[in-house]
């Protein structure tokens, strides 16, 4: 039934970039400026997204595809299709309601976005701290005591990564 109906429906012949104009006997008309249709058989064209303010145009709108936005320098995208722009912070900081704040002692953030995370707790694996953590970098754990014993093999597989946890300094 669907196939029969589509054969009889003149709008199904309208390609992407056009719409089926009911005001003109269902003739396929090109999408007007600043609008698009990404699929065939459309009865209307969609309005192009406009990248304004903190948004900037990553890809211009065409008759068959919407514009794509990203964020101006100092901001990064959030949400599907970059629906929001959020302020960048420096490494070693996180964004709060009051702006960018330094990571608390025992936490780090090695990116310009996201939250401060706790340092890895080396002692959970029976390891000691090889390199201390900073606001910008996680702790680095040394090898386990078993790796250092006289009978240790020369090559050990990498230890599995664990969830970061507090590391006493």
């Amino acid at each position: 039934f669907e196939r029969t109906r589509s054969l009889q429906d003149p709008c199904s012949n309208c390609p992407a970039g056009t719409f089926c104009d009911n005001n003109r006997n269902q003739i396929c008309s090109p999408c007007p400026p600043n609008s698009f249709s990404s699929a065939g058989g459309q009865r209307t064209c969609d309005i192009c997204r406009q990248c304004k303010g903190v948004f900037r145009t990553r890809k211009e709108c065409s008759s068959t595809s919407n514009a794509e936005c990203d964020c101006t320098p100092g901001f990064h995208c959030l949400g599907a299709g970059c629906s929001m722009c959020e302020q960048d912070c420096k490494q070693g900081q996180e964004l709060t309601k009051k702006g960018c704040k330094d990571c608390c002692f025992g936490t780090f953030n090695d990116q310009k976005r996201g939250i401060c995370r706790p340092w890895t707790n080396c002692s959970l694996d029976g390891k000691s701290v090889l390199v201390n953590g900073t606001k910008e970098r996680d702790v680095v754990c040394g090898p386990s005591p078993a790796d250092l014993s006289p009978g240790a093999s020369s090559v050990t597989p990498p230890a599995p990564a664990r969830e970061p946890g507090h590391s006493p300094q």
Epitope: D138, V140, P143, R162
Partner: nanobody
């Protein structure tokens, strides 16, 4: 995963110098801290020197002023320059690459200090 290969060991006279290299596969090597450990026969491995991803260094008291650790991230290599060598520096030297709680060893290179 990053793999580490040491080279540069050998026989050297007391008071001499040698430079060990720890070459890594993998483009994320620059984010790893790298340490040199050494192991003499029948003894546990001991930390010799460590360099963080930012280049901060730390040394065992027994090698301070004689050994220098450095890194060339463009070459994915960490070096251990060993000067004024003593017979007690004789050991197998191992490279250890670490990031958070993950760690990888090299296979080791023998350094023998003897006249």
């Amino acid at each position: 995963a990053v793999q580490l290969v040491e080279s540069g060991g050998g026989l050297v006279q007391p008071g001499g110098s040698v430079r060990l290299s720890c070459a890594a596969s993998g483009s994320i090597f620059s984010s790893y801290a790298v340490a040199w450990y050494r192991q003499a026969p029948g003894k546990p491995r001991e930390l010799v020197a460590v360099i963080s991803s930012e280049g901060t260094t730390r040394y065992a008291d027994s090698v301070k002023g004689r050994f220098t650790i450095s890194r060339d991230n463009a070459k994915n290599t960490v070096y251990l320059q060993m000067n004024s060598l003593k017979p007690e520096d004789t050991a197998v030297y191992y490279c250890f690459g670490g990031r958070s709680s993950m760690g990888t060893w090299g296979q080791g290179t023998q350094v023998t200090v003897s006249s």
